[in-house]
C-alpha cells in the first residue's frame, strides 16, 4: 500500500494544463482590469518567436509592487528552465522597445492562445 500510495499523490502538471492555467490567468487580468494595469508601467517588448517564456518573465520581473501580475510571474517561472532575476536582459527583447504592461499581457495572451491551438505546450 505504501508503494501504491504514489499513484494517488499529484504528479507534475502536464504542459497542456500549465499553459491553459496561464492563459486563464491572463484572461482574468485583462477582463478585471479597471485602473491602468501596474500604474501604466512600461516593460521591454519581446520577440515571441523563440525562448518566449524566459524572455517574458525577464520583462515582467522588473515590475515591482504590482500584485495583479504576481501570479503570472510565478507561473512563467515554471516554464523557464533557468532562474530569472530583475535586471536580466535577454537577446529576445526587442531593442529599445518598451510597451505598457497591459499591452504586454494582452499580446502574450493572444500568442499563448495560438500556441495552445497549435498544440505547442512547451
Amino acid at each position: 500500500l505504501t508503494c501504491l500510495g504514489g499513484f494517488a499523490s499529484p504528479g507534475p502538471v502536464p504542459p497542456s494544463t500549465a499553459l491553459r492555467e496561464l492563459i486563464e490567468e491572463l484572461v482574468n487580468i485583462t477582463q478585471n482590469q479597471k485602473a491602468p494595469l501596474c500604474n501604466g508601467s512600461m516593460v521591454w517588448s519581446i520577440n515571441l518567436t523563440a525562448g518566449m517564456y524566459c524572455a517574458a518573465l525577464e520583462s515582467l520581473i522588473n515590475v515591482s509592487g504590482c500584485s495583479a501580475i504576481e501570479k503570472t510571474q510565478r507561473m512563467l517561472s515554471g516554464f523557464c528552465p533557468h532562474k530569472v532575476s530583475a535586471g536580466q536582459f535577454s537577446s529576445l527583447h526587442v531593442r529599445d522597445t518598451k510597451i505598457e504592461v497591459a499591452q504586454f499581457v494582452k499580446d502574450l495572451l493572444l500568442h499563448l492562445k495560438k500556441l495552445f491551438r497549435e498544440g505547442q505546450f512547451n
Epitope: 517588448s45 519581446i46 520577440n47 515571441l48 518567436t49 510597451i99 505598457e100 504586454f104 493572444l110 492562445k113
Partner: nanobody, 118 residues
Framework: GVQLLESGGGLVQPGGSLRLSCAAS????????MGWVRQAPGKGLEWVSS????????YYADSVKGRFTISRDNSKNTLYLQMNSLRAEDTAVYYC???????????WGQGTLVTVSS
C-alpha cells in the same frame, strides 16, 4: 500606444517596382499575423496579402499573386511588401494592419499612396 507607420509609397511607372515598409511600435509585433490592404480611388478596401506571426505562411489576392511578396522582420518590428511588375490598377493607398480574428486586436496604419502611371 500602438502605432503602425507605412512608408515607401510614391509614383512609379508601369512595370516598375516599389517596396513598402510598415514599422510597428507599442505592441508585440512578433506575435501577430499581419497583412496589407489597399483602397483604390473611389473604391472599397481590398485585401492584398497576409503573413503569419512566424513568417512561414503567406497568402495573396489573385490580383497580385506572382508579383507581390510579403515578408517580415520580427527583430526589427517591421512588415514589408515588395511590389514588382506594377500596373495602373495597383494605384491605391496601401494600409498595413494586424490580421487577427480575435476582437480587440485590430490595428491599422495611416496608409501610404502608391501611384502607377506613365
Amino acid at each position: 500606444g500602438v502605432q503602425l507607420l507605412e512608408s515607401g509609397g510614391g509614383l512609379v511607372q508601369p512595370g516598375g517596382s516599389l517596396r513598402l515598409s510598415c514599422a510597428a511600435s507599442g505592441f508585440m509585433f512578433s506575435g501577430y499575423d499581419m497583412g496589407w490592404v489597399r483602397q483604390a480611388p473611389g473604391k472599397g478596401l481590398e485585401w492584398v496579402s497576409s503573413i503569419d506571426w512566424k513568417g512561414g505562411k503567406t497568402y495573396y489576392a489573385d490580383s497580385v499573386k506572382g508579383r507581390f511578396t510579403i515578408s517580415r522582420d520580427n527583430s526589427k518590428n517591421t512588415l514589408y511588401l515588395q511590389m514588382n511588375s506594377l500596373r495602373a490598377e495597383d494605384t491605391a493607398v496601401y494600409y498595413c494592419a494586424t490580421a487577427e480574428d480575435e476582437p480587440g486586436y485590430d490595428y491599422w496604419g495611416q496608409g501610404t499612396l502608391v501611384t502607377v502611371s506613365s
